[in-house]
Amino acid sequence: HNTTVFQGVAGQSLQVSCPYDSMKHWGRRKAWCRQLGEKGPCQRVVSTHNLWLLSFLRRWNGSTAITDDTLGGTLTITLRNLQPHDAGLYQCQSLHGSEADTLRKVLVEVLADPLDHRDAGDLWFPGESESFEDAHVEHSISRSLLEGEIPFPPTS
């Protein structure tokens, strides 16, 4: 999977969309998880309604919401009041039994609020690296990772 970058402004809401084949994933609940390290597990943040028929109902976990258009085949995640610590790598997942198929890998970038004059030094952007794969650009303040970019901040 290529990684798609979604950029949001600190303090505002960010909507992440994950398209999928509605028939292929028919009857499957969906989830949004946060990747813990480059090779680590993906920690569940929020999942759609336990009853698949009610997947259109928005479910919240803290400041993160999820809703699923099961006919149109679009999973939508809303990150409300975006904060610097929300930056990182996530996945949209399709669930079946104990399986989780990745629908899309998402890199969330948090941009400084141009109206906020506080120090933006704690806002994180991916740095340069040799290792990351190619990906295509997709907008809606989103793009895909460029070759050489990594989805995790360098550790000191």
């Epitope: 028919w26 009857g27 009853l51 039994g97 104990s98 399986e99």
Partner: antibody, heavy 123, light 107 residues
Framework: EVQLVQSGAEVKKPGESLKISCKGS????????IAWVRQMPGKGLEWMGI????????RYSPSFQGQVTISADKSISTAYLQWSSLKASDTAVYFC????????????????WGQGTLVTVSS | DIQMTQSPSSVSASVGDRVTITCRAS??????LAWYQQKPGKAPKLLIY???SLQVGVPLRFSGSGSGTDFTLTISSLQPEDFATYYC?????????FGQGTKLEIK
């Protein structure tokens, strides 16, 4: 009426290649996962792998990974199971089966089956 | 892989008997389990899915129960056409393995 019609029995020699088929009708073939199941003579059912013809997403059982290739041509509603070099131990009946989809259920169960294709590999 | 173990491997019974076949998963699979019937020279037939839901057209004498690792298929009153081999299959994860089968024979 939903039907899965498999190709006829095959007799092959060890080392030969083979491709058997499973043609779907009476349903939207593209939108259903199709599995292949092996049954060796007098033995039980073994799940080999599965394909989604819509995008050819394929999953294999570790026991069969690298031993067979599962493919599909959605334009003619047909799934395939192929071997590049048959062995005597490949002698079996091979079934294709459609994964059941219910209106609220992603399932993983098989509601329609082909009639089976007997493959005999002998020198 | 999740391994499925059926018991007994064969059972002899008479028409009218109540028969129970069990299936155990090597790890928890919630209710992601199916039961199939297969007669010689024929393709398997789906009887029960989601551990206890009866497939359309299957007689009510067939029932399934269980969750987690232990499951049961019960035939309440055996009919002549029920003598066959029965398989359980887990649908929790890939590969979707079957049990080794239970052959139901006429006593």
């Amino acid at each position: 009426e939903v039907q899965l019609v498999q190709s006829g029995a095959e007799v092959k020699k060890p080392g030969e290649s083979l491709k058997i088929s499973c043609k779907g009708s009476g349903h939207s073939f593209t939108n259903y996962w199709i599995a292949w199941v092996r049954q060796m003579p007098g033995k039980g059912l073994e799940w080999m792998g599965i394909i989604y013809p819509g995008d050819s997403d394929t999953r294999y059982s570790p026991s069969f990974q690298g031993q067979v290739t599962i493919s599909a041509d959605k334009s003619i509603s047909t799934a395939y199971l192929q071997w590049s070099s048959l062995k005597a131990s490949d002698t079996a009946v091979y079934f294709c089966a459609r994964q059941r989809t219910f209106y609220y259920d992603s399932s993983g169960y098989f509601d329609y089956w082909g009639q089976g294709t007997l493959v005999t590999v002998s020198s | 892989d999740i391994q499925m173990t059926q018991s007994p491997s064969s059972v002899s019974a008479s028409v009218g008997d109540r028969v129970t076949i069990t299936c155990r998963a090597s790890q928890g699979i919630s209710n992601w389990l199916a039961w199939y019937q297969q007669k010689p020279g024929k393709a398997p037939k789906l009887l029960i899915y989601a551990a206890s839901s009866l497939q359309v057209g299957v007689p009510l004498r067939f029932s399934g129960s269980g969750s987690g690792t232990d499951f049961t298929l019960t035939i309440s009153s055996l009919q002549p056409e029920d003598f066959a081999t029965y398989y359980c299959q887990q649908a929790d994860s890939f590969p979707r393995n079957f049990g080794q089968g239970t052959k139901l024979e006429i006593k």
